[in-house]
Amino acid sequence: GMEVRWCATSDPEQHKCGNMSEAFREAGIQPSLLCVRGTSADHCVQLIAAQEADAITLDGGAIYEAGKEHGLKPVVGEVYDQEVGTSYYAVAVVRRSSHVTIDTLKGVKSCHTGINRTVGWNVPVGYLVESGRLSVMGCDVLKAVSDYFGGSCVPGAGETSYSESLCRLCRGDSSGEGVCDKSPLERYYDYSGAFRCLAEGAGDVAFVKHSTVLENTDGKTLPSWGQALLSQDFELLCRDGSRADVTEWRQCHLARVPAHAVVVRADTDGGLIFRLLNEGQRLFSHEGSSFQMFSSEAYGQKDLLFKDSTSELVPIATQTYEAWLGHEYLHAMKGLLCDPNRLPPYLRWCVLSTPEIQKCGDMAVAFRRQRLKPEIQCVSAKSPQHCMERIQAEQVDAVTLSGEDIYTAGKTYGLVPAAGEHYAPEDSSNSYYVVAVVRRDSSHAFTLDELRGKRSCHAGFGSPAGWDVPVGALIQRGFIRPKDCDVLTAVSEFFNASCVPVNNPKNYPSSLCALCVGDEQGRNKCVGNSQERYYGYRGAFRCLVENAGDVAFVRHTTVFDNTNGHNSEPWAAELRSEDYELLCPNGARAEVSQFAACNLAQIPPHAVMVRPDTNIFTVYGLLDKAQDLFGDDHNKNGFKMFDSSNYHGQDLLFKDATVRAVPVGEKTTYRGWLGLDYVAALEGMSSQQC
C-alpha cells in the first residue's frame, strides 16, 4: 500500500508514533504514516533492510552501522537550537597549566560524560584506537581504556569488570552515594560533571562538548564548584598534537559529531520522506499544536522518534552515511565498533618456508600461553603471491610483505595494511630514501629532467634504489619510453653509458656495462657482486666519485657513509659530503642533507596485509600486546617476535630489524602505506610487464 512505515523501538515510542500517524491523517498529510514495532534500533534497521519497515531516526553510531552493514542512507537531518547547524563538536579539555597533549594521554587521569556516550566515550576512545594511540586486543575496549589511562571517571562503568580503574576518580553525591552511577547522583556525570572532574583536579583531561567549558565558567554556572572558574584557564587538545584556546573548537576538536538523522533503504526516494515529515513539522512543531513532534513529555520519556531539542528537520543533500557522518566521526566509529561475537577465534598467518613454519608454531604457542586473542594459526603457501591469493580466497588472514609485494597485494588482490614494521632511526637498510646524487658542479649543472645522454651509476640490476625506483620513476615521468616492453634497451638508449652490474648478462645491452671496471685486475667486469668495484650502493657512489658517471642512484645514507672520514678506503678517504648534491623531482638541486624533501621515493617498511573486511585494529591490538611481551630481543618470555636466529633463518614472519610493530594510522590503503612516489615508480616498471 501507499504508506510510510515508521519503526518504533519501545512502547512509549509506539504510542507517540500512533499519535503522530493519527495527527498526520487528520491533517490530510499524504502518504499515510504507519507504525511498526521493533525491539531496538538494531532490530528496526534489520526490519528496514528487509522491507518490513521504511524509516527510523538514528544517532551517529547507529547510522554508521546501518550504512556499513545494511546499505541504509540518511535522508532527513535534525537541527538543534543550541548547536552549530546539524552537528556539534567533541573536544578534549585540559588545564592550561598542564603539559598534556593528544600524544601524551597515556597514563593521565581522564573524565568522561558516561559510558557509551558520544562525546564522552565513543568519539575519544574511537579516535584514540583509530589513530593508533590506543591498541585494543580481542575487542575488549574497556580493558584497553582502563590500561591506557591512569584512572578515570566513566559514569556507568561500575557494572563492568574494570570498574576499579574506570570509576577510580568518581565521587558520587555529597554524601558519597551513587558513585559512578550514570545519573546526576554522580557529581562527575554528564558534560558539566566531566568538566567539574577536570576543574577540581580529579582528572587531567575531560572529554566533553565544544560548548561545555564556556557554559560552566566565567560566572555562567550557578553551582558553587564553578563560580570562580575562568575559561582562559583551560585549553583544548588538537589532533595534530598542539593545543588551542577553548573558543577555537571549530579548528581544534576530536570530531564533528553529526546530528541524528532519519535513515531509509538505499533506493528509497528520500525527497518523499522529507516532504511527509516537512508537512508534519509545519503543522506540529509549535507550542499550541494538538500534537508535538519534538516533545516526549506526554509519554513520560525523552527523545521519542526525534530528539526533543530538535528545532527543525532538514533534507540531506548528499544521501550517503559517509558524507553525513563526516570523515572525523567515521574514523572514530571505525576504531570503536568491534563486536566480540563477530571476532574470528583465529588469525591465520601465512608462512613460506620450513623455518617460518617453526617460528610461527612457536609464536602461536607463546601467544596462547599469554591468552592473547585472536589465537594464531599457521598456514603455508608457496610464495608471497600465493599468500595473497589465499588471503583473498579467505583461506588465510594475514602476511607480512615487502614494498613491491604490498603493491601487488593491494592492486591485484585488494588487500590493505593492518600494521607496519618500524626500524631503528639509524637503520637505513630497511626503510630509506632513493636519491639521485651528482657532483656539485656550477659550470655543468643539470637537473633530473636533463638526464638523457648522461652517464649513470646503478647499484645493480633489480636493486630497489639502484634500478627499480629510478628507472620506474623515469618511465612514469615519460623520459624513458620502452618499445615493446624492452626496458633494458630503453635505458641503454636513454643514458650515454652506464654501470648496472648483473648476474645473468645474457642479451644484456653492452652500454649498461660500459662504465663498469671489474676487480683490481680488470676481471669480473659488470658482475652482480662485490668483485665489481662499482657494484652495490657504495660502488655506484664510487662510480660517480671517480668520474666514470654523472649521476648515481643510491640510498640517502650512501653519501654520508662514504664521506667526511666515514670510509677509509683510498677512493673515499678524502671525500667531503658538501661536494655532492641531490637531483629533485621538481627540477631543483639540493644539499645531500635534504634527502627527505628531495628524493625519488621512500622505500617503505614492510607491512602486515589483510582483507579489507578484516578488523585492522584487532590485528594491531594483538601484535601490540604481543610485542610488549615478546618484542624485545632479550625478553625472558620464551619467544622473540623480531629475531629469527633460533630458526636458522632470517626475517621470518617479520624482519629481524623490526623494533616495533606500529599502527597504520591514516595509511589505510596500499597506496597510502607505500607513498605516491614509490607507487609511481612501481607503476612505471609494471607498465612494462607485457
Epitope: G71, D267, D269, L272, R275
Partner: antibody, heavy 119, light 107 residues
Framework: ELKLVESGGDLVKPGGSLKLSCAAS????????MSWVRQTPEKRLEWVAS???????FYPDSVKGRFTMSRDHARNILYLQMNSLRSEDTAMYYC?????????????WGQGTSVTVSS | DIQMTQSPVSLSASVGETVTITCRAS??????LAWYQQKQGKSPQLLVY???TLAEGVPSRFSGSGSGTQFSLKINSLQPEDFGTYYC?????????FGAGTKLELK
C-alpha cells in the same frame, strides 16, 4: 487499471533530437519515482534516467548532458528530451514506474517506443 | 560503476525441472537486487526485489536468495510460461545496471 503508454519514438539522424512522452494512469503518479530504460537491438537492458517523486533527476554518464527527463504532475505525463543522438542510442525505450518508495526497482513497464538513430 | 555478471548466458530445461540462475555484483550491493522476466515481444516484468521478496502476483515456485555480491534465482518445477529471458539488476544506487540476461529455453 495501471497504464504506462509511451509515444514519440521515430527514425532520426545522428546529431538530431527527439522527445519521448509517457502517459501514466491508474495510480497516484505524484508519489512515485519514474524511470526510462532502453533495450538495445542485442537485447541488453540499459538504464537511461530516473526522476524522484519531487523531480530530482539521475542519469548515467552515457546520456548526461544530452538527455533531460521531466514530469508534469498536473497531466500525469513523463518526458524524455533526447538531444545530440548517436547510433548507439538506437533501442526500444520503456517508461517504467519505480516500486512504492523506491527510486530504482521497477514494478511496471510500458510497452515501449522504438528509437532508431541512423543516417 | 557496479558490473552485474549473469550466468549462464543460456539454459535449456524441460517442464517440471528446477533451474538456478546466478548473478554476481562487482562490489557489495547488500540485498539491493531485482530479477525481471521478459518473454518474446513483451516488456520485462518484475519477479523479485530486495534479493528475495517476491513481487505481487509472482508464483511461489520462484525464489531469490543471496546478499552482498552473490545472488541467485531459483525456479522450481518449471512451467511452460516460465521460458524467456531473465535479467538481474541492482537497485543500490546510480548508475543502475543490469546483467546481460539468461535465456531459458525449452529443451
Amino acid at each position: 487499471e495501471l497504464k504506462l503508454v509511451e509515444s514519440g519514438g521515430d527514425l532520426v539522424k545522428p546529431g538530431g533530437s527527439l522527445k519521448l512522452s509517457c502517459a501514466a494512469s491508474g495510480f497516484s503518479f505524484n508519489n512515485y519515482a519514474m524511470s526510462w530504460v532502453r533495450q538495445t537491438p542485442e537485447k541488453r537492458l540499459e538504464w537511461v534516467a530516473s526522476i524522484s517523486s519531487g523531480g530530482t533527476t539521475f542519469y548515467p554518464d552515457s546520456v548526461k548532458g544530452r538527455f533531460t527527463m521531466s514530469r508534469d504532475h498536473a497531466r500525469n505525463i513523463l518526458y524524455l528530451q533526447m538531444n545530440s543522438l548517436r547510433s548507439e542510442d538506437t533501442a526500444m525505450y520503456y517508461c517504467v514506474r519505480g516500486q512504492w518508495l523506491s527510486l530504482y526497482s521497477m514494478d511496471y513497464w510500458g510497452q515501449g517506443t522504438s528509437v532508431t538513430v541512423s543516417s | 560503476d557496479i558490473q552485474m555478471t549473469q550466468s549462464p548466458v543460456s539454459l535449456s530445461a524441460s517442464v517440471g525441472e528446477t533451474v538456478t540462475i546466478t548473478c554476481r555484483a562487482s562490489e557489495i550491493i547488500y540485498s539491493y537486487l531485482a530479477w525481471y522476466q521478459q518473454k518474446q515481444g513483451k516488456s520485462p516484468q518484475l519477479l523479485v526485489y530486495n534479493a528475495k521478496t517476491l513481487a505481487e502476483g509472482v508464483p511461489s515456485r520462484f525464489s531469490g536468495s543471496g546478499s552482498g555480491t552473490q545472488f541467485s534465482l531459483k525456479i522450481n518445477s518449471l512451467q511452460p510460461e516460465d521460458f524467456g529471458t531473465y535479467y538481474c539488476q541492482h537497485h543500490y544506487g546510480v548508475p543502475v545496471t543490469f546483467g546481460a540476461g539468461t535465456k531459458l529455453e525449452l529443451k
